[in-house]
């Protein structure tokens, strides 16, 4: 089993919420969970993270809650726009560092 | 007792495709989790894809690996059904094809989280 793991697509309509579960091995416990956008040159912007940052993209409409009992951690992304469709990671220590799972996320 | 019957397997060529279908009617199927599992000759049964949906218009689309880019899953909450759109088939894709539903969502690659199963529709893909 790959270390982390997810919905490779998620559909939804604007307006909605979603909530992406990541799912993660025992020995990932206590590292940095976080959310990031995949830019068009590749790199992979951080939105949300465990450590409690929160981009202003995201203030007030999105909470990532870890679960370290079950192995998961939640990104809850409210008042979905089509803006907010594109290329998304869940991921697991530092950004880049390839222990992430791509998500697309159509709105 | 609650049944979940799949269908649309058989004998195709590589680089072919089958739509597998299962049905659900005993289900309150829109608050399930729907999975799709397979088992060649000898080999453990394994995870292939899988659906959830919220009730509210959104869906959730995991697949595994060896099917990502190849194999659609969808769901028809209407008709109490889940698909299986598998194309560019090998090979090695050859097994038996389970449908199951659950509704623990946990990891949905994890086989014993299903309590609910088919019997199977083989796919046979000839070189």
């Known amino acids: 089993k790959s270390p982390i793991f997810g919905p490779e697509e998620v559909n939804s309509v604007e307006g909605n919420s979603v909530s992406i579960t990541c799912y993660y091995g025992p020995q990932y416990a206590s590292y940095r969970k976080y959310w990031c956008r995949q830019g068009a040159r590749g790199g992979c912007i951080t939105l949300i993270s465990s450590e409690g940052y929160v981009s202003s993209k995201y203030a007030g409409r999105a909470n990532l809650t870890n679960f370290p009992e079950n192995g998961t951690f939640v990104v809850n992304i409210a008042q979905l726009s089509q803006d907010d469709s594109g290329r998304y990671k869940c991921g697991l220590g530092i950004n880049s560092r390839g222990l992430s799972f791509d998500v697309s996320l159509e709105v | 007792e609650v049944q979940v019957v799949e269908s649309g397997g058989g004998l195709v060529q590589a680089g072919g495709s089958l739509k597998l279908a299962c049905a659900a009617p005993g289900l309150t199927f829109s608050s399930y989790r729907m999975g799709w599992f397979r088992q060649a000759p000898g080999q453990e049964r394994e995870f292939v894809a899988a659906i959830d949906w919220n009730g509210r218009g959104t869906y959730y689309r995991y697949y595994a690996d060896s099917v990502k880019g190849r194999s659609t899953i969808s769901r028809d909450n209407a008709k109490n059904t889940v698909y299986l759109q598998m194309n560019s088939l090998k090979p090695e894709d050859t097994a038996v094809y389970y449908c199951?539903?659950?509704?623990?969502?946990?990891?949905?690659?994890?086989?014993?989280?299903?309590?609910?199963w088919g019997q199977g529709t083989q796919v046979t893909v000839s070189s």
């Open positions: 199951a539903a659950t509704t623990v969502l946990t990891d949905p690659r994890v086989l014993n989280e299903y309590a609910t």
